[in-house]
Each structure stands twice: as C-alpha cells, then as structure tokens.
C-alpha cells in the first residue's frame, strides 16, 4: 500500500477580514493511525491552530466529522479572520505513539493572506485657533488596512490640495498598515463655512473612497473690525455713540466702553446677526450726558474677542 500523503490543494487563500477562512487538507490513507494537527508556521516556533485529539479552539471548526472512522478530510474553517491571522498553515499527520504521538507527514502548506479595509479617516486640526492669512496643519489617520497600497487625497471645499505629506507605516512587511498625512491650509476670511476633507481609497472599498472631514469653523478666528460713530444730539444734552463690531468669528466677544479711560459699561455679545460667510456683526451703543462734562470726552470702544488681547477704537466727543 502507498505511504500516506497529506494533500493541501490550495497553495494560497485570500480572505477578507471578518470572514471565515477554509483551509483544505486530505490524507490519502487511513494508515498510520493517529491525529491531525494544524500549525501556523514551521519549525520549533510554530503555533498550534488545531489539535484533533485535545484542546479548545473556539475559532476553528472542522469541515468533516473527524470522529468517523474512515474520514480522510481534515479541512478546517477559521472564523472571524483578522490581518494578524496571515501566514502559512500546515496540516500535519501524527502517528500514534507512546507516550507521545510522533509527527509523521506534513502538507505543503497553505498561505493565508488577508485583505482588510481601512478604518474611517479621522481628521484633526490645530489645538489653537488661527487667523486668516495664516497656514494651519491638519492631520488625517486611517488604520488596519491590508494590502499596503492606498491613496489619500486632501480637499478644501471640493478643491484638491497639493501641499501635504503622507506616510504609510510600517515601511516593511506587516499584517496591516496605517496611513498618516499632514496637509497645510492657508486660511481666508471666508473660511468659517469651509471644510477640509481627507479621502482614502483602497482595493477593499466597494463604495466611494472613505472620507474624514474637519470644519474650519473650529480652527479659524476672524478678528472684528470696529467703527465708532456719533449719532445726532438728542434731547436733554444726550449723545448716542455706537460701536459697530463687524465680521468676527467665533461669537465669544466682550465689549467695554471707556469714558476718558474710565470704565463706563461692559457687555457680552448676545443678539448678534450672522453674515452669509458665517461671521457675525454686533452693535453696542452708549448714551453720553454731555452736560455732565466740562471738557471734550474721549470715548473708547474696547473689544476682547475670543480671549485675545483687546482691540479698541476711540472717538472724541466735542463738548461746546
């Protein structure tokens, strides 16, 4: 009778992460008597995947009923495959021995390769807000994909950006990979409604590329412009002075009126109006009793926007 051969018909198998891998193995004879074991890798450091005789292997099921006397199919299924499962799997026949079974013959091996989708890209911007004309950096990260080949593009409001640097790690062979990209974006005053998008394309993606977004509203600070104007003199010697605070973002703003350098009133922007570009306008007024002053009055509108150093605009009120 011919000596037993262990046949692994598949040289290689490709499986998607999360799916089940079937590793096929048949023996050509029932003799010698003894169990089958599956290993990942060869040599002394090989990893036991399944032992017909003993042990608990929750992810592994056999294709056939191995308890049947005449069974020669030793194929297994491994569930919920991850990239970490990649490697060469060997079906090994052991001969019954005492005290231990003896390795008799190994199959040629089946190389299991795993394809895994990239995670949804996460885009993060700078920790602190920046003002128009400044360049800010955004990062995009996606993890866990295989194979290594991946494309990443950056867009601002649908326009592709070119000033970015991308790295895929690790550089050498690995079970899965990560991508990290940093893009530089120049802010403009109109960017409150703008979006920065990182787009990742990979062989495993059946839909459009995966996208991660960042709203520039979380990054930009548009400082206000101030204008102080004097309204016509009202009855009882009262003058209405207004401070127009225009085109600022975000809304967080505190205004202080000073009369000749002395604090007259402080208020916080509340009923603001929003411009089309997402910035805000606000107006504050001050009633000044002219008769209470002998000399000219210097009125100052002082604005502290989003925790930044105060900016101010003054107006000289003539007392005639």
């Amino acid at each position: 009778e011919e000596e037993l051969q262990v046949i692994q018909p598949d040289k290689s198998v490709l499986v998607a992460a999360g799916e089940t891998a079937t590793l096929r193995c048949t023996a050509t004879s029932l003799i010698p008597v003894g169990p089958i074991q599956w290993f990942r890798g060869a040599g002394p450091g090989r990893e036991l995947i399944y032992n017909q005789k003993e042990g608990h292997f929750p992810r592994v099921t056999t294709v056939s009923d191995l308890t049947k006397r005449n069974n020669m199919d030793f194929s297994i299924r491994i569930g919920n495959i991850t990239p970490a499962d990649a490697g060469t799997y060997y079906c090994v026949k052991f001969r019954k021995g005492s005290p231990d079974d003896v390795e008799f013959k190994s199959g040629a091996g089946t190389e299991l390769s795993v394809r895994a989708k990239p995670s949804a890209p996460v885009v993060s911007g700078p920790a602190a807000r920046a003002t128009p004309q400044h360049t800010v950096s955004f990062t995009c990260e996606s993890h866990g994909f295989s194979p290594r080949d991946i494309t990443l593009k950056w867009f601002k409001n649908g326009n592709e950006l070119s000033d970015f640097q991308t790295n895929v790690d690790p550089v050498g062979e690995s079970v899965s990979y990560s991508i990290h990209s940093t893009a530089k974006v120049v802010l403009t005053r109109e960017d409150v409604h703008s979006q920065v998008i990182c787009e990742v394309a990979h062989v495993t993606l059946q839909g459009d590329p995966l996208r991660g977004t960042a709203n520039l509203s979380e990054t930009i600070r548009v400082p206000p412009t101030l204008e102080v104007t004097q309204q016509p003199v009202r009855a009882e010697n009262q003058v209405n002075v207004t401070c127009q605070v225009r085109k600022f973002y975000p809304q967080r703003l505190q205004l202080t009126w000073l009369e000749n350098g002395n604090v007259s009133r402080t208020e916080t922007a509340s009923t603001v109006t929003e411009n089309k570009d997402g910035t805000y306008n606000w107006m504050s007024w001050l009633l000044v009793n002219v008769s209470a002053h002998r000399d000219d009055v210097k009125l100052t509108c002082q604005v502290e926007h989003d925790g930044q150093p105060a900016v101010s605009k003054s107006h000289d009120l003539k007392v005639s």
Partner: antibody, heavy 116, light 109 residues
C-alpha cells in the same frame, strides 16, 4: 447570482442607445459594477464602473460618450452618440467580494450593431 | 494609462502540454492582476485573481504568479476544454482604472 444584459440592437449612428444589466441574487448597493465591450474578433475593453453608492468612474478614452447609472436592481449604460466604431458585444460584470481589482461574475453579453 | 502586453498572441499545443502565457505591465501594478478564459460567443470567466489566487471552482492545473510588472499564467497539463482565449487584466490602485491585455489564443496543435 446572475447578471443579464439587455437592450442590444441595430442602431443608427448618432442615435442614443441604453443598455441595461439586471442583477439577481445580490444587492447593487453592496458591489462595484462594471461595463466592458468587445468588438467582433477583438479583445476586451473597459468602459467604466459604478460604485456601490452610485458614483460612476470612466476609462480615460470615454470622454462623455457613455453614461453609467443604476437603480436598485439594474445598471444602465447610455451610449450618447454612437458611431460604427461602437459596434460590439457589451458585457456587465460584478467585482469580487474581496476587492475591486477583479470581476468574478459576468453577464452573457448583448450585441450592439451601429450602422447606417 | 497602463499598457498590458500579453505574449504570445497565439499558441498551438497538444493535450497534456504545459502552457505558459505572460503578461507585462508598463508600470508596477503590485499584485493587482487577474486572468480570464473566454470561449467564442461566451462571457469571460475568472481563473486567477490578485496574481496568484485560484478562483473557486477553477481546476488546480491553472496557476498564476508574478508581481510588479511581470506575470505568468500556467496550465500544467492542457485539457481539451482549455482551448480558448486568455486575457490578463490589471487594476491600478492610484488611477483606479482597469486595462486588459490583447489576449492569447490557445489552439489545438
């Protein structure tokens, strides 16, 4: 799992023609689908794909000559202004479950003849 | 665009022969290469994907190898039903476009 093309016929140059690919056994919202053609006695040529979410992508030579769209169970290929050069058997195909780099399910094809 | 050059364009062989068809890409496509078999009046059938993986139901006499720019389809022992035209097809991960080789017709000697 099955794909069947329809709409192939004898058409006049310049008169638009729409081919359909009807799918069964799977959902078009889960797979990338492609259109290909093969002129008589010639090789296979890629026309374009439509993603699972419905975005079309075309071969560089297409230049607006074809439009790919889909509904829940059919994928269409509109030939916008066909010429005699567009005479071919048109195939639809589905990409494999492991990735978009190969096509594992093909329809039998439908013949389009453009002639005056 | 990537060009795929298949060779030979045709070959004559006998049943039992070992047949090798090659495909060369004009630039690296890594392992994104598929092989199809097509018979007259029929749709292409997938044989090999990702350069070396045998599609389910395809006889093990078919095998694929290669990566980068050079790829090979081997039929270890030609059978009567294998007489057909074979196409390679690439996918480029940057352009996300597909290109076919011009085909190899395998005829009976």
């Amino acid at each position: 799992v099955q794909l069947v093309e329809s709409g192939g016929r004898l058409g006049q140059p310049g008169t638009s023609l729409t081919l359909s690919c009807t799918v069964s056994g799977f959902s078009l919202s889960s797979y990338v689908m492609g259109w290909f053609r093969q002129a008589p006695g010639k090789g296979l040529e890629y026309i374009g794909i439509i993603s699972s979410s419905g975005s079309p992508y075309y071969a560089s030579w297409v230049n607006g000559r074809f439009t790919i769209s889909k509904t829940s169970t059919t994928m269409d290929l509109k030939m916008n202004s066909p010429t005699t050069e567009d005479t071919a058997t048109y195939f639809c195909a589905r990409v494999g479950p492991l990735g978009v780099d190969y096509f594992n399910i093909w329809g039998p094809g439908t013949l389009v003849t453009v002639s005056s | 665009d990537i060009q795929m050059t298949q060779s030979p364009s045709s070959l004559s062989a006998s049943v039992g022969d070992r047949v090798t068809i090659t495909c060369r890409a004009s630039q690296s496509i890594n392992s994104y290469l598929a092989w199809y078999q097509q018979k007259p009046g029929k749709a292409p059938k997938l044989l090999i994907y990702s350069a070396s993986f045998l599609y389910s139901g395809v006889p093990s006499r078919f095998s694929g190898s290669g990566s980068g720019t050079d790829f090979t389809l081997t039929i270890s022992s030609l059978q009567p039903e294998d007489f057909a035209t074979y196409y390679c097809q690439s996918w480029h991960y940057i352009s996300r476009s597909y290109t076919f080789g011009q085909g190899t017709k395998v005829e009976i000697k």
